[in-house]
């Protein structure tokens, strides 16, 4: 229920917030979920609590898990799970889905792209912006506070744009990196039935237990803005709120604009740990509009080991 | 918008018991604490307790402990109040409260429910 | 319990006025909230964590305050503003609540 998910690359700094929301004057513990053994919070340690946010300066892949935290207020103790995820860095320039934050759409009135969870951070300007793996240069970009103005923004403006910052930490420096994709509205659309791109109807996806999966969920609906466009994800016909397993997290749903100007959305499955049960359910990735309603069904199976033969 | 609803005023006789209720809408039940606070001419405003409608945990003022029993039903969206033996000081006012889980403030209040003890 | 003192408990005023109502607290508290309540209605969230106006609240309205003496402060008072103004801690259970101090125009 009070569950987030966070995630970051090794050897980044990654900060996390406790989604349990409470004053700043209350105590806050933190516990590895797993083994129910409290975080530190001395800053010496290389992941430390300190009040509502857990710290890892920097990173490592191996931190990856559930973490509990607690706080407490004066009448109850409230507790929340963050879910963190850290991924190796990617060798090559594309940033996979499931690095990604929320879309952020402009216009040419309005074309602000803000640096993702950049206020949990000690950072001082200026930040670095990246497109598409290149550094933003010119007279059109201009980095302001902790957003990016691109001005007299046009279509091409589209896609993936970078923000690197530096947090401090008792003077030692730590990099920060954090992607989202920017859109630009096209005055002129329509709507159409939901076309659901991924995952192909009936598709089955190994994975090996104990791991970590992703399922997207990523539908078409039209051109331009879209009065209603929803992609979700249900299992066993149920919705993933009602489900209850926090192993299991569905993503807000992001929206994309791909190449030929379709409005398409996409959302993201996250599965921890995956185990036996997790291949008896049936994964649904559902897309509705105001045209109807497509479902598309994906199953999982245990990823078979190579046979290894003299 | 956020309203919470509570049941309508009550006679009853000393002894007995009696159960309010305080139907929220307008918002997620179970993200939000739900409070009730007593208010009388003499004593004001007095906090009774609080329930964690997604848990089921409760807390208390000391002072209302075996007097009041919190409990909520997550199908309804609805908060219950029960208050047992009671007494001609159990007459008063009675407010389920919503409480805004960022600053921790009393952001909703129901419209009353007046009880009165007598025979 | 942590005892909130409010005073004066009756507040007279005329309109365009400045007025302060004052609320001391038996031990330290880390903020404190303000509601108001007309006769016939619920209190009303007015000012919480110390000097934050609730939402739809007139910007002459004011808080302060630490430790143990908080202040709600009206500007320049107006005619709607005559009610029972009550200071409320959330800092250590029990919650509790001042007496109240009770605003009345000339």
């Known amino acids: 229920k009070f569950s987030k998910q966070s995630w970051g690359l090794e050897n980044e700094a990654l900060i996390v917030r406790c989604p349990r929301q409470g004053k700043s004057s209350y105590i806050v513990d933190w516990y590895y979920s797993q083994t129910n053994k409290s975080i530190p919070t001395q800053e010496r340690n290389r992941v430390f609590a300190s009040g509502q946010l857990l710290k890892f300066l920097p990173a490592e892949v191996a931190d990856s898990g559930i973490y509990t935290c607690i706080v407490r207020s004066p009448t109850f103790n409230r507790t929340g799970y963050a879910n963190v995820t850290i991924y190796k860095k990617q060798p090559d320039c594309n940033v996979p889905d499931y690095l990604m934050y929320s879309t952020v759409s402009g216009s040419e009135k309005n074309s602000k792209i803000y640096c993702p969870t950049i206020d949990l951070y000690n950072w001082t300007a200026p930040l670095e912006w990246f497109k598409n793996c290149q550094a933003l240069q010119g007279s059109r970009y201009k980095a302001h506070k902790s957003f990016l103005v691109i001005d007299n923004v046009m279509t091409d403006d589209a896609g993936d744009y970078t923000c690197k910052f530096i947090h401090n930490e008792n003077g030692a420096n730590y990099s920060v990196t954090a992607t989202r994709s920017f859109t630009v509205k096209d005055e002129q659309g329509f709507s159409r039935f939901p076309v659901i791109r991924a995952p192909a109807h009936n598709e089955t996806k190994e994975v090996e237990i104990g791991e970590n999966t992703n399922l997207t969920c990523s539908a078409c609906f039209g051109k331009g803005a879209q009065f209603l466009a929803a992609v979700q994800w249900q299992l066993n016909g149920n919705k993933i709120t009602d489900f209850s397993e926090p192993r299991i997290q569905q993503e807000e749903g992001q929206n994309q604009s791909f190449s030929d100007g379709l409005a398409c959305v996409n959302t993201v499955l996250r599965i921890a740990d995956v185990k036996e049960e997790d291949l008896l359910l049936r994964y649904d990735c559902l897309a509705l509009n105001l045209h109807g309603l497509r479902r598309h069904t994906i199953r999982l199976s245990r990823k078979n080991p190579i046979d290894h033969q003299s | 918008q956020v309203q919470l609803q509570q049941s309508g005023a009550e006679l009853v006789r000393p002894g007995a018991s009696v159960t309010l209720s305080c139907k929220a809408s307008?918002?997620?039940?179970?993200?939000?604490?739900m409070h009730w606070v007593k208010q009388t001419p003499v004593l004001g405003l007095e906090w009774i307790g609080a329930i964690d409608p997604e848990t089921g945990d409760t807390a208390y003022n000391q002072k209302f402990k075996g007097k009041a029993t919190l409990t909520a039903d997550k199908s309804s969206s609805t908060a219950y109040m029960e208050l047992s033996s009671l007494a001609s000081e159990d007459s008063a006012v009675y407010y389920c409260?919503?409480?805004?889980?960022?600053?921790?403030?009393?952001?909703?209040w129901g419209q009353d429910t007046t009880l009165t003890v007598s025979s | 319990d942590i005892v909130l003192t409010q005073s004066p408990p009756i507040l007279s005023a005329s309109p365009g006025e400045k007025v302060t109502m004052t609320c001391r607290a038996s031990s330290s508290v880390s903020y404190m909230h303000w509601y108001q309540q007309k006769p016939g209605s619920s209190p009303k969230p007015w000012i919480y964590d110390t000097s934050n106006l609730a939402s739809g609240v007139p910007a002459r309205f004011s808080g302060s305050g630490s430790g143990t003496s908080y202040s709600l402060t009206i500007s320049r008072v107006e005619a709607e503003d005559a009610a029972t103004y009550y200071c409320?801690?959330?800092?250590?259970?029990?919650?509790?609540f001042g007496a109240g101090t009770k605003l009345e125009l000339k």
């Open positions: 409320q801690q959330w800092s250590s259970n029990p919650l509790t």
């Open positions: 409260i919503r409480v805004d889980s960022n600053y921790d403030y009393f952001d909703y």
């Open positions: 307008g918002y997620t039940f179970t993200d939000y604490e």
